[in-house]
Interface confidence: medium
């Protein structure tokens, strides 16, 4: 064909407002003398006389011009049908992009401005090589790689298996029928960390403790447990109607509240980020709530945390987990046993 | 060479319908326009509508909206016009002709359509 | 609609006369304007297109001239098969219309 199909439907042919269009008679060879009519139009818009051969140019188009135009040869064969769409070549899109565990990252996409065209997206992704490394430039091992769009959601794409300490560029072309332009993006994993809230988190009364919760949770399904990729924790905590949070970071996945207000329902919330402090704070979870017992009042064990710290009593063994209720900065972190009084006093102490 | 046949006559009653036939020969049907025109003695030549057979589009004479239905079989080179609800006011030689979008190039000889009780 | 008027309404000339028909547009229409000619019992043929180009396998004596609203058909020197009657018919808006027409007749 004389018209070089421009990415969108058949049929179409594109241009910018304000600007020039030459449209193309698809049904003819190229250079053939043809007549130009608007669809709906009898008049004659361009006769084959004009030396343009299949070819219509419109000076400066704008909205009214968009629709459809009629070509044909000199001796009436039919050339076909044109239709004309008005819009912007592509800006740069903006893109952002997250993790919610370590080896994994996605990114989103959003145009820099409204074509009004058919618009598709080009991602991809490479590691970036340190200085001085001049030799792995066109390694295989540093990509591009291709990210995969998200099939269920559109304007994201992820990158799976990703090295934590490696920095990645990030690709995303948009491209419309008008043209096509770059957004480069240097990501990081541990600066673009930000773990889903943590997930089951329960509230339960203590009882004959009218001023004590017992808060319990779990990691986040989208976090995969390894020694070396440990999360911390955030807890806050309020009595209804109270306008301000308290705020505790716990060790492991719970935490007894000593200074709740007796006989109130209270609301308690969690947030965990990675225990080095990659990235940022998780959103807090969903709400929980919780109301202290009413029963007989309990001697109170000493407080050996000012208020907010575990109780030897409210410690309960992590069966559903064999992460560390505590992290160590040792090479190979042990599971702490909470099932041993000494080993937890000896933490607590 | 270029032929568009079409029947000589019709002789129809008031308030019925007739289709009326005009076969293309020497030529790739699909490429052009096909329009019917409606002649009487005293009102001229009066445009009905084109259709292109290579995708049934038309347009119509608005005044003619109602009157007519232009279709086509390719599988035949044949053009189709179907006149309805007759009055006398209809009786007419109707000439199909090939041509461009808006001209016309190639006649058929016309059909004489009487509408008579 | 466009209104094309045609004048004379009948014209009586000699053959090897000169002749000019003339078409009024009732509104501007550009080059938008073709003429026809129909012998007695015949279909009509495309004569000139676009107010003055020339069809293929048409004499070179018929010639038309015009633009806007007012155009001609001229006839260098008339030959018998000249006389018959000529339609104007403009194309520059739906629905397509034609001139009554005027029919030119031996003297």
């Known amino acids: 064909s004389p018209c070089p199909q421009a990415w969108g439907p058949p049929g179409v042919q594109y241009g910018q407002p304000g600007r020039p269009v030459m449209l193309c008679c698809p049904g003819v060879s190229a250079g053939t003398p043809v007549s130009w009519f608007r669809d709906g139009d009898s008049r004659l818009l361009q006769g084959p006389d004009s030396g343009l051969g299949h070819r219509l140019v419109l000076a400066q188009v704008d909205s009214p011009d968009e629709g459809t135009y009629v070509c044909q040869t000199l001796d009436g064969v039919s050339g076909g049908m044109v239709t004309l769409k008005l819009g912007f070549p592509p800006a740069r899109p903006e893109v952002s992009c997250q993790a919610v565990d370590y080896e994994n990252f996605s990114c989103t996409w959003s145009p820099g401005q409204v074509s009004g065209l058919p618009t598709r997206y080009l991602t991809s992704y490479r590691k970036k090589t340190l200085p001085g490394a001049e030799s792995q430039r066109e390694s295989p091992s540093t990509g591009p790689w291709p990210c995969p769009q998200d099939p269920l959601e559109a304007s994201r794409c992820v990158v799976h298996g990703a090295e934590f300490w490696s920095e990645y560029r990030i690709n995303v072309t948009e491209v419309n029928p008008l043209g096509a332009s770059t957004c480069l993006l240097d990501v990081r994993l541990q600066s673009i960390l930000r773990p889903d809230p943590p997930q089951g988190l329960r509230v339960e009364s203590v009882p004959g403790y009218p001023r004590r919760l017992h808060a319990s949770w779990t990691y986040p399904a989208s976090w995969r447990r390894q020694p070396h990729f440990l999360l911390k924790f955030r807890l806050q905590y309020r009595p209804a109607q109270h306008p301000a949070w308290s705020t505790v970071e716990p060790i492991g996945l719970e935490e007894v509240i000593t200074d709740a207000v007796a006989g109130l329902p209270h609301a308690v919330r969690v947030s965990a980020r990675d225990f080095l402090d990659a990235g940022t704070w998780s959103a807090w979870s969903p709400e929980a709530w919780g109301t202290p017992s009413t029963g007989p009042l309990q001697d109170e064990i000493p407080d050996w945390s000012q208020g907010h710290g575990q109780q030897l009593e409210a410690v309960v063994a992590q069966e559903d987990s064999p992460a560390p209720a505590r992290p160590s900065l040792q090479p190979d972190p042990r599971p702490l046993d909470h099932r041993d009084p000494l080993e937890q006093v000896a933490v607590l102490a | 060479q270029v032929q568009l046949q079409q029947p000589g006559a019709e002789l129809v009653r008031p308030g019925s319908s007739v289709k009326l036939s005009c076969k293309a020969s020497?030529?790739?049907?699909?490429?052009?326009?096909m329009h019917w025109l409606k002649q009487r003695p005293v009102q001229g030549l009066e445009w009905i509508g084109n259709?292109?057979?290579?995708?049934?589009?038309?347009h119509y004479n608005q005044k003619f909206k109602d009157k007519a239905t232009l279709t086509v079989d390719k599988s035949s080179s044949t053009a189709y016009m179907q006149l309805n609800s007759l009055t006398s006011e209809d009786s007419a030689v109707y000439y199909c002709?090939?041509?461009?979008?808006?001209?016309?190039?190639?006649w058929g000889q016309g059909t004489l359509v009487t509408v008579s009780a | 609609d466009i209104v094309l008027t045609q004048s004379p309404a009948t014209l009586s000339l000699s053959p090897g006369e000169r002749a000019t028909l003339s078409c009024r547009a009732s509104?501007?229409?550009?080059?938008?304007l073709h003429w026809y000619q129909q012998k007695s019992h015949e279909a009509p043929r495309l004569l000139i297109k676009?107010?003055?180009q020339s069809i293929s396998g048409i004499p070179a004596r018929f010639s038309g001239s015009g633009s806007g609203t007012d155009f001609t058909l001229s006839f260098s020197s008339l030959e018998t098969e000249d006389f018959a009657v000529y339609f104007c018919?403009?194309?520059?808006?739906?629905?397509?219309?034609f001139g009554q027409g005027t029919k030119l007749e031996i003297k």
């Open positions: 002709a090939r041509g461009d979008y808006v001209l016309f190039t190639y």
């Open positions: 676009y107010a003055s």
């Open positions: 259709i292109g057979p290579s995708d049934s589009k038309t």
């Open positions: 509104q501007s229409i550009s080059n938008n």
């Open positions: 018919q403009q194309s520059y808006s739906w629905p397509l219309t």
């Open positions: 020497g030529y790739t049907f699909t490429n052009y326009w």
